[in-house]
Amino acid sequence: SGVFQLQLQEFINERGVLASGRPCEPGCRTFFRVCLKHFQAVVSPGPCTFGTVSTPVLGTNSFAVRDDSSGGGRNPLQLPFNFTWPGTFSLIIEAWHAPGDDLRPEALPPDALISKIAIQGSLAVGQNWLLDEQTSTLTRLRYSYRVICSDNYYGDNCSRLCKKRNDHFGHYVCQPDGNLSCLPGWTGEYCQQPICLSGCHEQNGYCSKPAECLCRPGWQGRLCNECIPHNGCRHGTCSTPWQCTCDEGWGGLFCDQDLNYCTHHSPCKNGATCSNSGQRSYTCTCRPGYTGVDCELELSECDSNPCRNGGSCKDQEDGYHCLCPPGYYGLHCEHSTLSCADSPCFNGGSCRERNQGANYACECPPNFTGSNCEKKVDRCTSNPCANGGQCLNRGPSRMCRCRPGFTGTYCELHVSDCARNPCAHGGTCHDLENGLMCTCPAGFSGRRCEVRTSIDACASSPCFNRATCYTDLSTDTFVCNCPYGFVGSRCEFPVGLPPSFPW
């Protein structure tokens, strides 16, 4: 679609005569008829296949024609066409005398014709005007012409329709040849696809407008290249969505079970050695001079009863000193000057002579100890209770008072809440410090796996092209992680190739 434009510039008819040679009375009131048609080697009468146009009376005899285009007038003359411009044409321009106001062909006598010119040739679409002048014996006509495309039509023959747009069906302007030129930030055949933020992950990210990066389910981060771990994952990471791979020292489905209490909490004080002994449990081995579950209590050096044979201990700044009873000497009153004749064994201990009576040894009854059976046995000195249990002397025996969650003679056993098989439908039971947790099989949920839920969304193998399927446990939907070279919610499209559909 385009317009053939004809600009009349000057008409000369100095004698004011008609084509017949007869003069116009009083002068030649001149108007023009234009016929545009297909190319003819010899221009002949017949239909004006490309269109016709007439002017009003423009002047008398000789006159210049004013350019009226700016004022919406009729010069240049417009001959619109709704077809592909063929590049060739024939043009007939007739000058007529109008005796009256009726310019219709049937209202004019045939001899009212002043002059007739006919040209033909090639004409390419373009903005430049072609200037021409045609002279007969009596008249001269100067004019120019061109062909331009109608609004929104482009190309060498005005055949390409293109309308700039900036909506969700395209973001572009039109090039001179009618091809689309995408606005910044847009791409695709119709410039309808936004160019995402540079580096936005090809499969895991997308965008609705340029320089944006929106993440698909299971992914996060500025470039959507970080997976989202399982909901509730505490001390773990993921390499694919909804995973929970535990950091060192942590365990359980949500990596919230502390397997390395010693490292994470450093409970042992005063340089004691910490040993992990189970989930959230530990044992502190105290350095000399310290005691307590966490070795938090400083021992007096006399607390270990270093003085034997009834010697009394006195704390000193740099240690201790034993005051020995009569008949004993040595750093710990360990040497005796007594013999069995002196009845040195207390609490029913029996005396045995040694070294020909120069020395003796006491054999103590149960529950008593010491060189002279003078000490009641303290069965708690060896810290026999595990997992922070408290040791209690009970006459001839001892017992351990265990912390919550532990049992056994020495608190060495972890109380199992799982013993009564609380998890339904084959759920796996995990002991926690303050209770238990059930890991449910597919299709079940709830604290005890008592609720039947939907089947794994990945069970139907919805992902194509060897993509990996992940079930989003929070929504019961699936997410496809595409291999390199494929995109789409099911990884069904090869990258760089337009989708091909069967319709």
Partner: antibody, heavy 121, light 106 residues
């Protein structure tokens, strides 16, 4: 050739939410070459465009309905849906889903058969 | 909001030409689609991008668009062409339909 099929209740009470689903068969909804639209036609009246969506979930709504309309897409089911809240008798219409082609300048080359939704108590 | 105006009805004799107009401000700078809808049926796309016919649409349907007016022309109208016709264009991000024209084949 692609087929579109609307589904949903034919009767909705005033002030409630109208919910319809369009199931696409014979082609994937996951293409950047199409938008998926909803158009309605009250009995004896003309067509009114409600809104559209693409496979990524980008939505565009008629400003006169925007405050009440939500369109969503489920690519795994090859479906898209319409929710229109706070309905009145004026929302009684045949509701069509349609495929709008980018290559056709936004022309809708495939339509569902339409479903009549009546708003009445 | 943007509006497209169509005449409510157009009558035409069989074999004659029916012209349906669609007017809107600056419509010539927008792409116009035309839909045919017969009673009880879904609309059918007959013209897109002003003047292009989808496959399967008879050649007697043609379209043009310039200035503020788009025109759908049915040349050699047949009785089966009796239907409602709607023009449609996009204004920014919003789809806009004309009010519709009922074509009656006398």
């Amino acid at each position: 050739e692609v087929q579109l099929q609307e589904s949903g209740p034919g009767l909705v009470k005033p002030s409630e939410t109208l919910s319809l689903t369009c199931t696409v068969s014979g082609g994937s909804i996951s293409s950047s070459n199409y938008y998926w639209g909803w158009i309605r036609q009250p009995p004896g009246k003309g067509l009114e465009w409600i809104g559209d969506i693409n496979y990524n979930g980008n939505t565009y709504y008629n400003p006169s309905l925007k405050s009440r309309v939500t369109i969503s897409v489920d690519t795994s089911k090859n479906q898209f849906s319409l929710k229109l809240s706070s309905v009145t008798a004026a929302d009684t219409a045949v509701y069509y889903c349609a495929r709008e082609a980018v290559a056709l300048g936004g022309g809708a080359d495939d339509w569902g058969q339409g479903t009549l939704v009546t708003v009445s108590s | 909001s943007y509006e497209l105006t169509q005449p409510p009805s157009v009558s035409v004799s069989p074999g004659q030409t029916a012209s349906i107009t669609c007017s809107g401000e600056g419509l010539g700078d927008k792409y116009v689609s035309w839909y045919q809808q017969k009673p009880g049926q879904s609309p059918v796309l007959v013209i897109y991008e002003d003047s292009t016919r989808p496959s399967g649409i008879p050649e007697r349907f043609s379209g043009s668009n310039s200035g503020d007016t788009a025109t759908l022309t049915i040349s050699g109208t047949q009785p089966m062409d009796e239907a409602d016709y709607y023009c449609q264009a996009w204004d920014s991000e919003t789809g806009v339909f004309g009010s519709g024209t009922k074509v009656t084949v006398l």
